[in-house]
Interface confidence: low
């Protein structure tokens, strides 16, 4: 009967340059148990080679010369006694592209090349990129181990060299960045930066790289409060802001963090479970009232911690003036001026544009001041007769502005005309 030589192997296999591939293979050959038992030798040859003289690409025969260019990279895998001819190809090179055939030899009777079942190997340009593995999320300040590996690569061939680059790595020891593994302690400023692992096969032209963008979780480090786009100055977690009474106020609180912190505003200095007055980073007051003087707190809540800042709001107002109004009384001319301001203003009286300070030593005038609620009152008593038309003025001022009013006393007339003249600083 006809001897049966059969080979099961795929017709073609494609592998990228520098990577590895396992080609499953099984064979059968005629063998009778009553034959003597010489060793079974199998070989993989490059197509076109003459088996008797050629160097093999892989064999289990220790006496056969292996092609130097495939030594250690082409290996028989599996047990040939169990008719397994699987071929492992590592660190594939462009020049490996071509056809290969399998041959079996056992004693003098079994010598056969399976020329009908050639393996076509195609090595293509390396487009596979390495994978960068690490446990996510990266947390600021927490050391994390990163590893770089190339899917489909294996130990065969010259060693792989690695290089890591990225802002997050400086100033590491260069040796550290040449390993396939790396321990990185990310900082907030590393968020969004690139980290690249480049792999190169020593002595080969083959290089490939992958770049990942780092996603670093970090709690807010600072809080900034903006008013009209301008950052307020912060001293010891407190910011001071004077606001004109009645004015609209819009404040923006910002606390850079990843993922973004939840920002909220509270009245005063809140307890941890207090209810916010705003659940965003924006605090809007349509008309600031003096009752709102005191403080607000902006809190940035983050899974990795929280931060808060106190805003000390001082409400100010320009002086408002009522008066002066004058009337004749028993002791002389009695003029009154009422005013209101935050902070409390100063006041002075003028007679014919000349200041009347304190009480007259000659007793010609007397000034009295009192306050009731937000208003303060001052009165001026002028003793003696008035010889001509007189102008009496009162002026109130604080650091934010001033206002003055005057009355013209016309001799011989009972009605006294008044006018208020505002004056801002």
């Amino acid at each position: 009967e006809k001897p049966v030589y059969e080979l099961q192997v795929q017709k073609s296999v494609t592998v990228q340059e520098g990577l590895c591939v396992l080609v499953p293979c099984s064979f059968s050959y005629p063998w009778r148990s009553w034959y003597s038992s010489p060793p079974l030798y199998v070989y993989w040859f490059r197509d076109g080679e003459i088996p008797y003289y050629a160097e093999v690409v892989a064999t289990n025969n220790p006496d056969r010369r292996v092609k130097p260019e495939t030594q250690g990279r082409f290996r028989l895998l599996g047990d040939v006694q169990k008719k397994n001819c699987s071929l492992s190809i590592g660190d594939a090179r462009m020049e490996d592209t071509g056809s290969y055939f399998f041959r079996v030899e056992r004693g003098r009777d079994v010598k056969y090349s399976y020329q009908q079942n050639k393996l076509n190997l195609e090595v293509t340009a390396l487009i596979e990129k390495p994978d960068i593995h690490f446990l996510e999320p990266l947390e600021s300040g927490r050391p994390t181990r990163l590893s770089c590996s190339l899917p489909g690569s294996c130990e065969a061939g010259p060693p792989l060299t690695f290089s890591w680059t990225g802002n997050a790595l400086s100033p590491l020891d260069p040796e550290t960045t040449r390993s396939s593994e790396l321990t990185l302690t990310p900082r907030p400023e590393d968020h969004g930066t690139n980290l690249t692992c480049q792999m190169k096969r020593q002595g080969a032209q083959v290089t490939t790289e992958r770049t990942v963008q780092l996603n670093v979780s970090y709690a807010p480090q600072t809080i900034t409060i903006f008013r009209n786009g301008i950052a307020l100055e912060i001293l010891q977690n407190t910011s001071y802001l004077p606001v004109l009474e009645g004015q609209a106020l819009r404040l923006l609180c910002d606390a850079p963090s990843n993922p973004p912190a939840h920002l909220s505003w509270f009245q005063g200095s809140p307890a941890l479970n207090a209810t916010p007055i705003s659940n965003t980073g924006i605090l809007e007051l349509r008309r600031v009232r003096s009752a709102e003087e005191g403080g607000f707190t902006c809190r940035a809540q983050h899974p990795l911690g929280f931060l808060q800042i106190f805003l000390n709001l001082s409400v100010y107002s320009l002086p408002q003036l009522l008066g002066p109004s004058c009337s004749w009384e028993a002791e002389g001319l009695h003029c009154r001026c009422s005013f209101r301001a935050r902070p409390a203003p100063s006041l002075c009286w003028r007679l014919e544009e000349k200041p009347l300070e304190g009480n007259s030593s000659q007793g010609s005038f007397k000034v009295n001041s009192s306050s009731a609620g937000p208003w303060a009152n001052s009165s001026l008593i002028l003793h003696g007769g008035l010889s001509s038309d007189l102008k009496v003025s009162c002026k109130a001022w604080n650091i934010y502005g001033s206002q003055s009013g005057s009355v013209l006393l016309l001799q011989g007339r009972s009605n006294l005309g008044t006018g208020v003249v505002p004056a801002a600083l």
């Epitope: 076509n120 293509t124 340009a125």
Partner: antibody, heavy 119, light 112 residues
Framework: QVQLQQSGAELVKPGASVKLSCKAS????????IHWVKQRSGQGLEWIGW????????KYNEKFKDKATLTADKSSSTVYMELSRLTSEDSAVYFC????????????WGQGTTLTVSS | DVLMTQTPLSLLVSLGDQASISCRSS???????????LEWYLQKPGQSPKLLIY???IRFSGVPDRFSGSGSGTDFTLKISRVEAEDLGVYYC?????????FGGGTKLEIK
Amino acid sequence: QVQLQQSGAELVKPGASVKLSCKASGYTFTEYTIHWVKQRSGQGLEWIGWFYPGSGSIKYNEKFKDKATLTADKSSSTVYMELSRLTSEDSAVYFCARQEEGGIGFDYWGQGTTLTVSS
Amino acid sequence: DVLMTQTPLSLLVSLGDQASISCRSSQSIVHSNGNTYLEWYLQKPGQSPKLLIYKVSIRFSGVPDRFSGSGSGTDFTLKISRVEAEDLGVYYCFQGSHVPWTFGGGTKLEIK
């Protein structure tokens, strides 16, 4: 649209070196191989070698292995060919051409760079 | 190296006539993956070459259907069914199966 823009004509002295450039645009630079081809005046075409920007893989025609060096700058999508130890035999037009990975051939060519080696 | 030999060296044809160019390789140019990477290029005077045919018989996009390629193993042919004035130039065959890749010497097509 796909374009391969080559550097201008060069006049160099024997023994010197020259670096020719081929700037690619209009496609993903790393996905196609760039080849270099030589054409001496009034003569045929000779394949010099290829450069695959995707991985930096290079293949030379053995005849040009000690003559040509292929490099690339991914950031500017440019492939370079440096020719060294120039002689009059190197005077020629040098083309760069793009090849699709599926073996479709050189589907786009540069306009060519004329190199004159003369003392 | 695989030597690509083109015949004839030059071809003089009338407009509307058929032209045929032969290309022979010194060895089989069937790649180990089973494909035959045989291509035809046209170089017009003062221009870069242009791809006409790849993998023996596939017309590149935009190439008129009057161009056709055929052949196998070591013998290949380019035919132009009805020559037009714009077809003049030098035609090159090329093999991309075995490194170094090689071009034929070229065939100059001239119009009578």
